[in-house]
Interface confidence: low
């Protein structure tokens, strides 16, 4: 049985050899071969080469995908904790403290106010803001928290917004706002959180936090 296989292999090998020899003869323009014959052989050969090249490309693609799944696609996640600030700015301040997460340098906390990503992709971005306010002490306007995006070379834009009316509790009533959504971020994009009155934000453990996760 094995011997028959061997003969079959040798026959195939001989046919391949004859085919290659014929191509050589076509190229040198031997008169014994008709032009039609040569054209047919050449197109057959080109077809083989094309198939080989296509296979090579597919293998390359598969390999590069494997790389992306591993080295090229590290986990990117951040979770930062609110930081009381003497600044009067409406942009909330955050810190790498307590139970925070900063997976690697592909996401960074810049100037304590914005999370900046280095890789393009879909990210789940969230913020929880707890505030304590009183209807009488506050203006008529509700307490508004906004999740904002600043992409390189573009204007800032609001991604998410939530509003709560002030409590009647005294001295103030605690309320929480949670914002969260999936957004496409470009390399160098920054996200930050704005509130109408930062002095009302609660900075106790676990009350106010901000983060993102690359999907």
């Amino acid at each position: 049985h094995r011997r028959l296989d061997k003969i079959e292999d040798e026959r195939n090998l001989h046919e391949d050899f004859v085919f290659m020899k014929t191509i050589q003869r076509c190229n040198t323009g031997e008169r014994s071969l008709s032009l039609l014959n040569c054209e047919e052989i050449k197109s057959q050969f080109e077809g083989f080469v094309k198939d080989i090249m296509l296979n090579k490309e597919e293998t390359k693609k598969e390999n590069s995908f494997e790389m992306q799944k591993g080295d090229q696609n590290p986990q990117i996640a951040a979770h930062v904790i609110s930081e009381a600030s003497s600044k009067t700015t409406s942009v909330l301040q955050w810190a790498e403290k307590g139970y925070y997460t900063m997976s690697n340098n592909l996401v960074t906390l810049e100037n304590g106010k914005q999370l900046t990503v280095k890789r393009q992709g879909l990210y789940y971005i969230y913020a929880q803001v707890t505030f304590c306010s009183n209807r009488e002490a506050s203006s008529q306007a509700p307490f508004i928290a906004s999740l904002c995006l600043k992409s390189p070379g573009r204007f800032e834009r609001i991604l998410l917004r939530a509003a709560n009316t002030h409590s009647s509790a005294k001295p103030c009533g605690q309320q929480s706002i949670h914002l969260g959504g999936v957004f496409e971020l470009q390399p160098g994009a920054s996200v930050f959180v704005n509130v109408t009155d930062p002095s009302q934000v609660s900075h106790g453990t676990g009350f106010t936090s901000f983060g993102l996760l690359k999907l």
Epitope: E83, A95, E96, K97, G98, Y99, Y100, T101, M102, S103, N105, T108, L109, N111, G112
Partner: nanobody, 123 residues
Framework: EVQLLESGGGLVQPGGSLRLSCAAS????????MSWVRQAPGKGLEWVSE????????YYADSVKGRFTISRDNSKNTLYLQMNSLRAEDTAVYYC????????????????WGQGTLVTVSS
């Protein structure tokens, strides 16, 4: 192997200034919170200051707030403590300490310490 090497200590007059340095090696410096801790002669350890991996935020003990400044240069793997308006009670051996945790932090839990550098404030 993790190594922390302090330098910059010495004798200084009250009201004077000193800058301590701590050269770190053997770990990814920028990922970890770092602290300065001191021990005055015959006393226990006292936490002085802490800085996060990125350099923000920084924390200080009430006894040094407004006089000491902690900073770091992640490109040089070095931690600093700038000490101004020094007082006699600042006399101590100053240690730099690496936080035990990187991603999830617990304040003032350290796994590596330097050998310390002595700061003496005296006229």
């Amino acid at each position: 192997e993790v190594q922390l090497l302090e330098s910059g200590g010495g004798l200084v007059q009250p009201g004077g200034s000193l800058r301590l340095s701590c050269a770190a090696s053997g770990f990814t410096f920028e990922l970890y919170r770092m602290s300065w801790v001191r021990q005055a002669p015959g006393k226990g350890l006292e936490w002085v200051s802490e800085i996060s991996g990125s350099g923000f935020p920084t924390y200080y003990a009430d006894s040094v707030k407004g006089r000491f400044t902690i900073s770091r240069d992640n490109s040089k793997n070095t931690l600093y403590l700038q000490m101004n308006s020094l007082r006699a009670e600042d006399t101590a051996v100053y240690y730099c300490a690496k936080s035990l945790h990187d991603k999830t932090q617990h304040h003032q839990e350290f796994d590596y310490w330097g050998q310390g550098t002595l700061v003496t404030v005296s006229s």
